[in-house]
């Protein structure tokens, strides 16, 4: 089982220093600041699932040097920043979505010896990201469709 921690209060102070190794902001309808970094130097697991996020501002994650698992499931992501994707040791947990194509390509080109990248469908089943992209995301489809949400149901 994955580790877990209790959801933080909905009123998040982004200026606060978080000392925990796990932070759970799941389902809080958060809007992540674009010009501010989360202050959580110990965090290894960050749960941002179910927040309606369309993007992951790279500045927000800039100081999370210990981060190992980033859960962004159930967010309508339209893009994943290249600088975030290039963090080879970061385990991104995200919905199967054509917007992950850039993440997949950057990992493939910059990160050696990686385990296969996974994504999750609407039934919470895991899929190989490469296979999903191949089947569900024709060339140019992700950028042409805005949010790029093309779930592959099995």
């Amino acid at each position: 089982l994955e580790p877990s921690c209790t959801v933080s209060s909905a009123d998040v102070d982004w200026n606060a220093e978080f000392s925990a190794t796990c932070l759970n902001f799941s389902g809080l309808s958060l809007s992540l600041p674009h010009n501010q970094s989360l202050r959580a130097s110990n965090v290894i697991l960050l749960d941002l699932s179910g927040n309606g996020l369309r993007e992951l501002p790279v500045t927000f994650f800039a100081h999370l040097q210990k981060l190992e698992v980033l859960n962004v499931l159930r967010n309508p992501l339209s893009r994943v920043d290249g600088a975030l994707a290039a963090r080879c040791d970061l385990d991104l947990q995200a919905d199967c979505n054509c917007a992950l194509e850039s993440w997949h390509d950057i990992r493939r080109d910059n990160c050696s010896g990686q385990k296969p990248l996974l994504c999750w469908d609407t039934t919470s089943s895991q899929h190989n990201l490469s296979a999903f992209l191949e089947v569900s995301c024709a060339p140019g489809l992700a950028s042409a469709t805005g949010s790029g949400h093309h779930h592959h149901h099995h």
């Epitope: 580790p3 877990s4 209790t6 000392s19 190794t21 796990c22 040097q65 698992v69 385990d91």
Partner: antibody, heavy 125, light 107 residues
Framework: QVTLKESGPGILQPSQTLSLTCSFS??????????VSWIRQPSGKGLEWLAH???????RYNPSLKSRLTLSKDTSSNQVFLKITSVDTADTATYYC?????????????????WGAGTTVTVSS | DIVMTQSPKSMSMSVGERVTLTCKAS??????VSWYQQKAEQSPKLLIY???NRYTGVPDRFTGSGSATDFTLTISNVQTEDLADYHC?????????FGSGTKLEIK
């Protein structure tokens, strides 16, 4: 096979500086997520976490001892060092180093999977 | 600091019985709790991590459960080789802290 082995002076006098070495093999402390902690245990008592050093040389200390602790590592020789200044009889204990691994399958956990056998330190005048 | 309180301090059981050790955290630590077994004159060995995950090679008679503040280590069908001290520890927040231990004796 992952192993860790602590070494120290055995006996020292109050007010002296305790220098401990953790020599390890079977893993690299330059691997992302990897780390080593020092934990001590007075005879017949519980465990007390002292300090942790990360792969990137970042360090965390127990606030109750922070002013007396200095943690360092030599990645190339697979060693971690802990110095405790101004020791007292209360520092008499068995000192362990333990590894925190990076779990690539189901990450985000934090635990100590391998411990050294420990080195006994006695502070006595 | 987060205080981890273990109970009982010691217990004596017969071979084949079921043992339940408890650990209570002074504040919510999610599932960031591990259990360690320490036999006489030996270093601690990892049994359970993430509150309920059995570590590699640990017999399946050892089971961990709980979250937030209340955690349990259960040993079903206790064996003579289970004679040891058992420590719980939290890694949710620095400084990491351990319980004072439970000594398991075998009748």
């Amino acid at each position: 096979q992952v192993t860790l082995k602590e070494s120290g002076p055995g006996i020292l006098q109050p007010s002296q500086t305790l220098s401990l070495t953790c020599s390890f093999s079977g893993f690299s402390l330059s691997t992302s997520g990897m780390g080593v902690s020092w934990i001590r245990q007075p005879s017949g008592k519980g465990l007390e976490w002292l300090a942790h050093i990360y792969w990137d040389d970042d360090k965390r200390y127990n606030p109750s001892l922070k002013s007396r602790l200095t943690l360092s590592k030599d990645t190339s020789s697979n060693q971690v060092f802990l110095k405790i200044t101004s020791v007292d009889t209360a520092d008499t204990a068995t000192y362990y180093c333990a590894r925190r691994p990076r779990d690539y399958y189901g990450g985000g956990h934090w635990y100590f999977d391998v411990w050294g056998a420990g080195t006994t330190v006695t502070v006595s005048s | 600091d987060i205080v981890m309180t273990q109970s009982p301090k010691s217990m004596s059981m017969s071979v084949g019985e079921r043992v339940t050790l408890t650990c209570k955290a002074s504040e919510n630590v999610g599932t960031y709790v591990s259990w360690y077994q320490q036999k006489a004159e030996q270093s601690p060995k990892l049994l359970i991590y993430g509150a309920s995950n059995r570590y590699t090679g640990v017999p399946d008679r050892f089971t961990g459960s709980g979250s937030a503040t209340d955690f349990t280590l259960t040993i079903s069908n206790v064996q003579t080789e289970d004679l040891a001290d058992y420590h719980c520890g939290q890694s949710y927040s620095y400084p990491f802290t351990f319980g004072s231990g439970t000594k398991l004796e075998i009748k």
